[in-house]
Every structure is written in structure tokens, then in C-alpha cells.
């Protein structure tokens, strides 16, 4: 069971202190940019964090979603990374959610965060390069201090 | 770096309460869950609940302490407190306060210890 | 009540390779991670390992953490005189709702 709490905005970046974003396409991707070119690509930048009390002792439980015209909430249903548009419910009945993730501090860390499937155990939000893009998908955790899982969230409330 | 400060040493008289403090500094307090462990003298550690100041104040206890112990947190001075009632002689140890920001069971800080001595 | 056994003590030259094993049972380390934390003496306890196998940053890497089935153990090579300490094994227990410890070993580096 998981029971909505309170939101707020963020700005998401992997370690390379790109930004992520959601383009036209509604795909999540993640792209140099200055402060001002993510204050310019706003909302498509800013990401609504909502955090959610967990009936089991797993972490803070959190979706993501952004508001461009509709909302829309990052799902990783079969393994796949993709925003439905959808707001993030009140409560879910469930121990397992395709929208809901685990928001992790890195131990020795602090500011560093990962994001862990609650559907899929041991798979982490990452940023992978495909050919020129950089997509965001679900991964499963293959070797010790993986960067690509590694992301800074910084509050824009 | 957060850091844990606890409060200093106590000497209680048996039935009586003890509460020890445990400030956070240099981090966000309310994302992360705070357990409270013990360790009686030459033994191993015993952990005895946790509050996710976070969840608005959501607490868990062990099934041993329940009934005996109240763990509370105040968000505007970022500290957690742990009350102990009905305090016996087995009751002295060393009460450290952990906090565990990667997953509520992983206690990745922990303060430097608040010894509580129960003698009449 | 310990669910988590431990050896008391293990013992090891320099320079050498010692292991500390954990064992519980399907309600904890069967169903759950496994942490280990590392305490000198006169000290607060420090996390050394996570998830099984994972160490936090400042942890040298000559330690490391494995589990398999209902038990988990924790890998110290190149031992050095400041690994001289007490080592405790943590988990889930599902039965008892509630985290659980080993009892501890004390490792001498002789």
C-alpha cells in the first residue's frame, strides 16, 4: 500500500550534469544545458516529485511525472521507460507499483540519488547513450558504482 | 557530511524515564528514516525503532520495546528523540541514534553514543 | 534473542585473507539483504557493506560482502592492524517484523 504525501518540483541531472527533459515526442531525455536554457525549457525541465508513505520498510517511495499540457507520470511497465499520462494517484493498493520508485541517498553520498523499480527489484533509472541521444531507462544494477543510476535532484520549490 | 550529535550520559534510578536527544546537522532531516540501537555493556547491538521524521512522524518499534519506548522527532531544530520508561538495571548501555537515507534498514550515520546507566 | 549467528571471534596475520560468515534462516537473510557494519573499539559502529555487496564510499575495497542462500559472509583481505574490531551482520526479519543483528565477531589481527 502506498498513500500520497506531499510534491515538489525538481530538476533531475545524471553525473554529467545533463539535464533531463521531455521532449515533443514525450520520450525522457537528458541534454547539456545552462541554467537559463532549463529555465527556458520549462516545464518540459521540471519534474514533480511526489512522495508516498510505503506500508513495508523499503525507502521513500516517489513518482515522477512533469506538466506540459496534460500531466504525465513516468512508468516503467515491462521494463520500459515511458511518461502516461496519468496524475500520480492518491493511493495505490499495492506493494508493487510500474510508477512508483524508490528514491535512494548513495551511502558516503549525500546529494547523489538513484531510483529503484518497486515492480522490478534491483533495476535502477539510468541514462544510457543511443546513438546520438541520451535516454533515460530502467537497468538492472550490473556492477559496483555504476554512474549511469547516479542522478542529482535539485529542488526548484 | 551529516553528522549525528547525541546528548550526554545519564544515570536514572530504576522505573524511572530517560530521553536521549540526537541532532542532525549538515543534511536534509525529514527524507530519512532515524533508528535507535543499543549496546549493553561487552554485548552486540540491539535495534530498537525508528521514526521516519519524513512520513509525518511515522514510528516503528520492536516488539520488545513496545509499550516502553516513544521515539519523536522535531523537524525545526532537525533532532530525534528517544524516551525509555520503566527503566531497569538491564536497561544500561550505550544508545547511539542511526540514519539511513539509502533504505530505511541501512544505517549509513550514526552519532557518537549516549551511555544510560540504571542503578539505584 | 540473536537470530543472526555469527563466529565470536576469527583471528588472522597481516597481510592475510579472513572471512566472517552469518547465518539465518528464510525470514531473513533468505528473503532480504544483508549489511555489515565494522565497530573499533570505544567507537560507533560504521556501515561497511550494504546490499550484500555494495560499500559505501571511504570503505577500502579489500573488504567486501557476498551472500548466498540463507547466509552471508564478509571478506577481509590484506588484513592490516586497524581492521581489529568487532564486525556485526545485519537483515530483515520478516517473522518478527523487525531489523535483526548478529551477535558479532571480534576479528584479532595478530
Known amino acids: 500500500y502506498f498513500g500520497k504525501l506531499e510534491s515538489k518540483l525538481s530538476v533531475i541531472r545524471n553525473l554529467n550534469d545533463q539535464v533531463l527533459f521531455i521532449d515533443q515526442g514525450n520520450r525522457p531525455l537528458f541534454e547539456d544545458m545552462t541554467d537559463s536554457d532549463c529555465r527556458d525549457n520549462a516545464p518540459r525541465t521540471i519534474f514533480i516529485i511526489s512522495m508516498y508513505k510505503d506500508s513495508q520498510p523499503r525507502g521513500m517511495a516517489v513518482t515522477i511525472s512533469v506538466k506540459c499540457e496534460k500531466i504525465s507520470t513516468l512508468s516503467c511497465e515491462n521494463k520500459i521507460i515511458s511518461f502516461k499520462e496519468m496524475n500520480p494517484p492518491d493511493n495505490i493498493k499495492d506493494t508493487k507499483s510500474d510508477i512508483i520508485f524508490f528514491q535512494r541517498s548513495v551511502p558516503g553520498h549525500d546529494n547523489k540519488m538513484q531510483f529503484e523499480s518497486s515492480s522490478y527489484e534491483g533495476y535502477f533509472l539510468a541514462c544510457e547513450k543511443e546513438r546520438d541521444l541520451f535516454k533515460l531507462i530502467l537497468k538492472k544494477e550490473d556492477e559496483l558504482g555504476d554512474r549511469s543510476i547516479m542522478f542529482t535532484v535539485q529542488n526548484e520549490d | 557530511e551529516v553528522q549525528l550529535v547525541q546528548s550526554g550520559a545519564e544515570v536514572k534510578k530504576p522505573g524511572s524515564s530517560v530521553k536521549v536527544s540526537c541532532k542532525a546537522s549538515g543534511g536534509t532531516f525529514n527524507s530519512y528514516a532515524i533508528s535507535w540501537v543499543r549496546q549493553a555493556p561487552g554485548q552486540g547491538l540491539e535495534w530498537m525503532g525508528w521514526?521516519?521524521?519524513?512520513?509525518?512522524?511515522?514510528?516503528f518499534y520492536a516488539q520488545k520495546f513496545q509499550g516502553r519506548v516513544t521515539i519523536t522527532a522535531d523537524e525545526s531544530t532537525s533532532t530525534a528523540y528517544m524516551e525509555l520508561s520503566s527503566l531497569r538495571s538491564e536497561d544500561t548501555a550505550v544508545y547511539y541514534c542511526a540514519r539511513a537515507a539509502y533504505h530505511p534498514l541501512v544505517f549509513d550515520n550514526w552519532g557518537q553514543g549516549t551511555l544510560v546507566t540504571v542503578s539505584s | 534473542d540473536i537470530v543472526l549467528t555469527q563466529p565470536p571471534s576469527v583471528s588472522g596475520a597481516p597481510g592475510q585473507r579472513v572471512t566472517i560468515s552469518c547465518s539465518g534462516s528464510s525470514s531473513n537473510i533468505g528473503n532480504h539483504y544483508v549489511n555489515w557494519y565494522q565497530q573499533l573499539p570505544g567507537t560507533a559502529p560504521k556501515l561497511l557493506i550494504y546490499?550484500?555487496?555494495h560499500r559505501p564510499s571511504g570503505v577500502p575495497d579489500r573488504f567486501s560482502g557476498s551472500k548466498s542462500g540463507t547466509s552471508a559472509s564478509l571478506a577481509i583481505t590484506g588484513l592490516q592492524s586497524e581492521d581489529e574490531a568487532d564486525y556485526y551482520c545485519q537483515s530483515w526479519d520478516y517473522s518478527g517484523f523487525s531489523t535483526v543483528f548478529g551477535g558479532g565477531t571480534k576479528l584479532t589481527v595478530l
Open positions: 521514526i521516519n521524521p519524513f512520513y509525518i512522524g511515522e514510528t
Open positions: 546490499r550484500n555487496n
